[in-house]
């Protein structure tokens, strides 16, 4: 089988601080040393990139400084955290894994994690 399988949880509930974490695991058919992990958000038929990181196997996952994502990697498993989420960001978040180097290239796309975000209720004014 030449396809690369990617597994991720079906549903995740973001914390009251707007933080959601999930694991993205891939079954690598090749011996990649360089891997790219991308989080995509799918709304209707539109797919947009949320964040992406390229890492060397055995090294840490590094997102850009201004990214809303952070993560760690361990073997073929990536622990992803997305922060700054609001209710309007509720949606399907897809984990895409690409084995970049050495060739051959492999693409793996998860089924997506539905992240639910609930904005916290504002604190009532105190009369004290």
């Amino acid at each position: 089988c030449k396809a690369m399988h990617v597994a991720q949880p079906a549903v995740v509930l973001a914390s009251s601080r707007g933080i959601a974490s999930f694991v993205c695991e891939y079954a690598s058919p090749g011996k990649a040393t360089e891997v790219r992990v991308t989080v995509l958000r799918q709304a209707d038929s539109q797919v947009t990139e949320v964040c992406a990181a390229t890492y060397m196997m055995g090294n840490e996952l590094t997102f850009l400084d201004d990214s809303i994502c952070t993560g760690t990697s361990s073997g073929n498993q990536v622990n992803l955290t997305i922060q700054g989420l609001r209710a309007m960001d509720t949606g399907l978040y897809i984990c895409k894994v690409e084995l970049m180097y050495p060739p051959p290239y492999y693409l793996g796309i998860g089924n997506g994690t539905q992240i639910y975000v609930i904005d916290p209720e504002p604190c009532p004014d105190s009369d004290f």
């Epitope: 089988c1 030449k2 396809a3 690369m4 991308t38 990139e49 970049m100 492999y106 693409l107 796309i109």
Partner: antibody
């Protein structure tokens, strides 16, 4: 809207070189991997080469490996294909295509014809 | 590499009829990584279907894709005059990226 425009068409003799360009507009070029695909007259589609968004990693079809070089200049929103040691069997319409977020080739240029003949 | 074989080579049909095109992979190509393209004479290919069954932006719902594993199908429910063209399947799950040899849908 996404637009890809190839240039560099021409008739060249076997063994000579030619460089194709693909000017991109309507999207953030530096965020997308790019492909070259060719189509010989009256034939099907053949993938030629791929380059990552940052230009670091490149892949080639066996038929062009060692002869063709794919490159890009993200500051100019342009993709290139340097073709050396051209052969008659390289005669084709060459298309540049964008690798979509989910993997398929979601946008294509109009193509440019390269004829290798003595 | 994954070899894709399309059948039939040519399909002769009339407008309004249903077209069924087949694409068989030499080894399992995950359904997430199978696309269909349409190419009209003298034009560039156009993405119709990706992930075996998802329609690309702006593609009419008379086009549908199905299948998994090694067998995939493109169906055009009712052929319109502008649908007569060549159709290619493609796998994009690993390099080298490969295309089928194409199926020509012509007017009967």
């Amino acid at each position: 809207q996404v637009q890809l425009v190839e240039s560099g068409r021409g008739i060249v003799q076997p063994g000579r070189s030619l460089r194709l360009s693909c000017a991109a507009s309507g999207f953030t070029f530096s965020s997308y991997g790019m492909h070259w695909v060719r189509q010989s007259p009256g034939k099907g589609l053949d993938w030629v080469a791929f380059i990552w968004d940052d230009g670091k990693n490149k892949y080639y079809a066996d038929s062009v490996k060692g002869r063709f070089t794919i490159s890009r200049d993200n500051s100019k929103n342009t993709l290139y294909l340097q073709m050396n040691s051209l052969r008659a069997e390289d005669t084709a319409v060459y298309y540049c295509a964008r690798k979509g977020q989910l993997g398929p080739f979601d946008s294509w240029g109009q193509g440019t014809l390269v004829t290798v003949s003595s | 590499e994954i070899v894709l074989t399309q059948s039939p080579g040519t399909l002769s049909l009339s407008p309004g009829e249903r077209a069924t095109l087949s694409c068989r992979a030499s080894q399992r190509a995950g359904s997430s990584y199978l696309a269909w393209y349409q190419q009209k004479s003298g034009q560039a290919p156009r993405l119709l279907i990706y992930g075996a069954s998802s329609r690309a932006t702006g593609i009419p719902d008379r086009f549908s894709g199905s299948g998994s594993g090694t067998d995939f199908t493109l169906t055009i429910s009712r052929l319109e005059p502008e649908d007569f063209a060549v159709y290619y399947c493609q796998q994009y799950g690993n390099s080298p990226w490969t295309f089928g040899q194409g199926t020509k849908v012509e007017i009967k």
